[in-house]
Interface confidence: low
């Protein structure tokens, strides 16, 4: 599989992966206690023909044009996922594994 | 036990300033957002001000912006709210609580402390 | 801002009978709303966040319902001790908002 990367000054216009670091403090999630913030990264940019696009499926679908289908969109292909400390809601302290946390790549789907 | 315990209220002249204390303890005080709520005589609730746990995001009402000023002590389970060119209009009851965040709101509250502001 | 009406602002109950109070958002506000009790000369207490969970240690009487803009506060079976000032508040975004307050009285 492959995925491009950018960064905020980058020029390029189709799907594309961005960093972004998410701060948990600044949305009020105090319940998370570490991290308290990580690099979460989101996609971006166009979808244009067969570019990125992770299953045939997609460009098929788009070529028959069936009613009420999108054009293919810019989304995360593989995520990671990252440990956290945090209280649940009965105020224990968990320690865990939270699957798809992080946008490891990004393809059109 | 979650507790927190109010002081510094009193009887001030208009324009005259306060300092208010809440004391925390029984929770891991920096890792929780705190607030202040005030209540005026037979009125309903006010959001005074809230500090996000290591004081990084301060967040004030519209219309109390510039007179009051948030502050929190993590090494010393505090958070403090500094009233200035106090006005008769703030006469109230004022609560700190805990917050646990946008999922969760604030759960805690502290027993209360008078304001008064009258010449 | 986000403006909250809560109502109505009071209400005559006896003991045993259902209560409802409601509390409408101005914009979607999803389900972060919290419904806190008080009584006289004493500190709000927290009943329900997340608009439908109950806080730790309240009893199962009091329950919270809706998301988005409309919510609501039910007792099934009022008791004695729940003769106090109910207010909704809005924690999605700064700054916060408290509805006016509902006053439940003995009829």
């Known amino acids: 599989d492959f995925g491009l990367d950018c960064d905020e000054h980058s020029t390029e216009s189709r799907c594309c992966r961005y960093p972004l670091t998410v701060d948990f403090e600044a949305f009020g999630w105090d319940w998370i206690i570490a991290p308290k913030r990580y690099k979460a990264n989101y996609c971006s940019g166009e979808c244009e023909f067969v570019f990125l696009q992770k299953y045939p499926h997609t460009h098929l679908v788009h070529q028959a044009n069936p009613r009420g289908s999108a054009g293919p969109c810019c989304t995360p292909t593989k995520m990671s996922p990252i440990n956290m400390l945090y209280f649940n809601g009965k105020e224990q302290i968990i320690y865990g594994k939270i699957p798809a946390m992080v946008v490891d790549r990004c393809g059109c789907s | 036990q979650v507790q927190l315990v109010q002081s510094g209220g009193g009887l001030v002249k208009p324009g005259g300033s306060l300092r208010l204390s809440c004391a925390a303890s029984?929770?891991?005080?920096?890792?929780?957002?705190m607030n202040w709520v005030r209540q005026a005589p037979g009125k309903g609730l006010e959001w005074v001000s809230s500090i996000t746990s290591r004081g990084t995001y301060i967040f004030y009402s519209d219309s109390l912006k510039g007179r009051f000023t948030i502050s929190r002590d993590n090494a010393n389970n505090s958070l403090f709210l500094q009233m200035n060119s106090l006005r008769v209009e703030d006469t109230a009851v004022y609560y700190c609580s805990r917050d646990r965040g946008y999922t969760f709101g604030p759960d805690y509250w502290g027993q209360g402390t008078l304001v008064t502001v009258s010449s | 801002d986000i403006q909250m009406t809560q109502s109505p602002s009071s209400l005559s109950a006896s003991v045993g009978d259902r209560v409802t109070i409601t509390c409408r958002a101005s914009q979607d506000i999803r389900n972060d709303l919290g419904w806190y009790q008080q009584k006289p000369g004493k500190a709000p207490k927290g009943l329900i966040y997340?608009?439908?969970s109950l806080q730790s240690g309240v009893p199962s009487r009091f329950s919270g319902s809706g998301s988005g803009t409309e919510f609501t506060l039910t007792i099934s079976s009022l008791q004695p001790e729940d003769f106090a000032t109910y207010h909704c508040l809005h924690y999605d975004f700064h700054p916060r908002t408290f509805g006016q307050g509902t006053k439940v009285e003995i009829k």
């Open positions: 997340a608009a439908s």
């Open positions: 029984g929770f891991i005080f920096n890792t929780y957002t």
